[in-house]
């Protein structure tokens, strides 16, 4: 039986050009995490494998950095980065757990106080 739950950073509203951290945390299970995949709309961004370490997809290499931890740092944000991101935890023996984070990247003309961003 799958008893675990995934907690996420929560949805994020950020400004174009900034950087953000996407993080998930798997709790309430003793299952072993074998791999974490980060995906956006059927595109693989990165993999963190327990044995092999990190692999960043070539098309994202210049803007995606591994970590902190099993999280992912997205840099030089563009409006096109707006969308839903998935952290997919592959575990043994439980199976797969998925967390969802929606990232909204705003043009500075639309952004307001409350849209968080950090200059990388």
């Amino acid at each position: 039986m799958m008893t675990g739950t995934i907690e996420t950073t929560g949805n994020i509203s950020a400004e174009k050009g900034g950087s953000i951290i996407l993080q998930c945390h798997l709790s309430s299970t003793t299952a072993q995490v074998t791999q974490v995949n980060w995906e956006q709309q059927d595109q693989l961004l990165a993999i963190c494998n327990a044995d092999l370490g990190w692999h960043i997809s070539p098309s994202f290499k210049d803007r995606v950095a591994p970590g902190p931890g099993l999280g992912l740092t997205l840099q030089s944000l563009t409006v096109n980065d707006t969308g839903e991101y998935f952290c997919i935890y592959h575990t043994y023996p439980d199976g797969t757990y998925t967390g969802r984070i929606f990232l909204e990247v705003l043009e500075s003309s639309v952004a307001e106080h409350g849209a968080r961003f950090q200059i990388p």
């Epitope: 996420t8 949805n11 409006v79 839903e84 909204e104 639309v110 409350g114």
Partner: antibody
Framework: EVQLQQSGPELVKPGTSMKISCKAS????????MNWVKQSHGKNLEWIGL????????SYNQKFKGKATLTVDKSSSTAYMELLSLTSEDSAVYYC??????????WGQGTTLTVSS | DVVMTQSPLSLPVSFGDQVSISCRSS???????????LSWYLHKPGQSPQLLIY???NRFSGVPDRFSGSGSGTDFTLKISTIKPEDLGMYYC?????????FGGGTKLEIK
Amino acid sequence: EVQLQQSGPELVKPGTSMKISCKASGYSFTGYTMNWVKQSHGKNLEWIGLIVPYNGGTSYNQKFKGKATLTVDKSSSTAYMELLSLTSEDSAVYYCARGLSFRYDYWGQGTTLTVSS
Amino acid sequence: DVVMTQSPLSLPVSFGDQVSISCRSSQSLANSYGDTFLSWYLHKPGQSPQLLIYGISNRFSGVPDRFSGSGSGTDFTLKISTIKPEDLGMYYCLQGTHQPPTFGGGTKLEIK
């Protein structure tokens, strides 16, 4: 002035599909998300999903995956929601709503869907 | 999914009254950057829902200052300082911090 104009009421038969439109005007269509909300029995509000007009990306409430399909036509600043395999449970008022920082600041007038044989 | 619990379900009022509506979430609505995506809406009969408050306490443009929002974490409140006839209707809170966004069950503001 921001406006979201939805298509009119629909009476359809069970098992069929139908598409609701939401035409946006008065703002940059690609700068905001478009969300869809269901109101059943004149009370409960449920988020169905959203679409990002800029890149076509979507996010769905798992409850409505396979029931609703969201699309946009950027050239006409129109968002669409297709509802599939309709049953009486789908009878409701459906709203489109502009999203910004995870709030819905402007809403369409609502489209009433009645599913009946 | 995050469960949003509103109370009371019904709120009988007289014009001029001050009232509070409570909204509690099943988990914290603060994201990792300290933003809390909690908003309030008024849905009047025969109309579309309208945004009143966003980000816990920010009034949307054109919303009278008799409406105010407060709270943090899992506990939020909408206050209306002096009830007017145009304030009657259903009030909903909405959390947008976690996927999927979820609404409270609604509070009906009606005349005693």
